[in-house]
Interface confidence: medium
Amino acid sequence: QGHLVHMTVVSGSNVTLNISESLPENYKQLTWFYTFDQKIVEWDSRKSKYFESKFKGRVRLDPQSGALYISKVQKEDNSTYIMRVLKKTGNEQEWKIKLQVLDPVPKPVIKIEKIEDMDDNCYLKLSCVIPGESVNYTWYGDKRPFPKELQNSVLETTLMPHNYSRCYTCQVSNSVSSKNGTVCLSPPCTLARSEQKLISEEDLGGEQKLISEEDLHHHHHH
């Protein structure tokens, strides 16, 4: 009875909820529920009945496999979906699918907290800002990943004469998407700018605007 499957999908996508095993032979009835008591669709006597719900017009049942197709899922569709099958014997069997719908992560903005020349080296403190999301961070210096232990929203590093990383990329990701933001330096220790934009390596994630601390303070989190 406790078949529970987890699925994580990106919002806006089309999703198929199905079970990995065959349905009981010649079952009498099949019902999909949203949470425990909200019926979405029921198959009985060779026809499907769709119930009034937020899914109406967005779902389709395949009685052969029991698969439920949902189009254009949104975060509000997060729930445990239950498929109950009534066997010929009168016994019920159920399967549960826990669906998590996540929005794609937004493109991060790299904020220059500090940049300064010292000891003939260049000190950098960067923060990777995205509005109120729970994400994973990965930092790269010229595509070289920084150690996993430093993967949070802030990177501080010192460039020495034989350390030539010039472009710094923050990659933010959740389990369904990832986006990059990149800033670049001109040796020894100045931002590479073009019309007040930070030039970035094309293959590492597009341009990043140079914006002020005031613009960002309400987004900034560590």
Epitope: M118, D119, N121, Y123, K125, G141, K143, R144, P145, F146, P147, K148, E149, L150, N152, V154, E156, T157, T158, L159, M160, N163, S165, H222
Partner: antibody, heavy 118, light 108 residues
Framework: EGQLLESGGGLAQPGGSLRLSCAAS????????MSWVRQAPGKGLEWVSL????????YHADSVKGRFTISRDNSKNTLYLQMNSLRAEDTAVYYC???????????WGQGTLVTVSS | EIVLTQSPGTLSLSPGERATLSCRAS???????LAWYQQKPGQAPRLLIY???SRATDIPDRFSGSGSGTDFTLTISRLEPEDFAVYYC?????????FGQGTKVEIK
């Protein structure tokens, strides 16, 4: 060129504690990520701990996690390693080093010997 | 974690000879992010080579690094008396950073 000088090594009993220090000179200390690397007698090098320039990020190797704590006092240009619940296998020369852009270690201090024995 | 295996364990050579030290990784080292260090008895290690083939500051040009993927080499073209020491490789392509067990270059 910066210089690093470790101190605080010595003899400790199993289960005991020691605190190592690394004094830096000739650099703007608070701007550099730092690391401790150790070398057991007659053995190779093993990375132990790291700390970012501000002290905001720290990390420890699995072999010392929960027992060792890296910290720094940038006003004193000093790096620390607090070593608790010491074991015989922690016996080693402990080096502090600048963790150059989190890639390689350069320069290094001269090392301080920690011996754990009853 | 990436395991680095250095060979030979000991290399017995005479001054003026060429030394070839090997460092083999258990899996490919990302973008050849490998460094070499020299350690003399009673001293701290010193950085020689980074990014597999770039010489660190003030390192003589008789030291050279090469290789890619899983196989890397440190070559000392003509051994000087001060080159007899232990040499370590270290990878920084993935966490945790790891070292090889060392190769001792001794006077024959």
């Amino acid at each position: 060129e910066g210089q690093l000088l470790e101190s605080g090594g010595g003899l400790a009993q199993p289960g005991g504690s020691l605190r190592l220090s690394c004094a830096a000179s000739g650099i703007t200390f608070g701007r550099y990520a730092m690391s401790w690397v150790r070398q057991a007698p007659g053995k190779g090098l093993e990375w132990v701990s790291l700390i970012s320039g501000s002290g905001g990020s720290t990390y420890h190797a699995d072999s010392v996690k929960g027992r060792f704590t890296i910290s720094r006092d940038n006003s004193k240009n000093t790096l620390y390693l607090q070593m608790n619940s010491l074991r015989a296998e922690d016996t080693a020369v402990y080096y502090c080093a600048i963790y150059n852009n989190y890639n390689w270690f350069d320069p290094w201090g001269q090392g301080t010997l920690v011996t754990v024995s009853s | 974690e990436i395991v680095l295996t250095q060979s030979p364990g000991t290399l017995s050579l005479s001054p003026g000879e060429r030394a070839t030290l090997s460092c083999r990784a258990s899996q490919s080292v990302s973008s050849n992010y490998l460094a070499w260090y020299q350690q003399k008895p009673g001293q701290a290690p010193r950085l020689l080579i980074y990014d597999a083939s770039s010489r660190a500051t003030d390192i003589p040009d008789r030291f050279s690094g090469s290789g890619s993927g899983t196989d890397f080499t440190l070559t000392i073209s003509r051994l000087e008396p001060e080159d007899f020491a232990v040499y370590y490789c270290q990878q920084y392509g993935s966490s945790p950073r790891t070292f090889g067990q060392g190769t001792k270059v001794e006077i024959k």
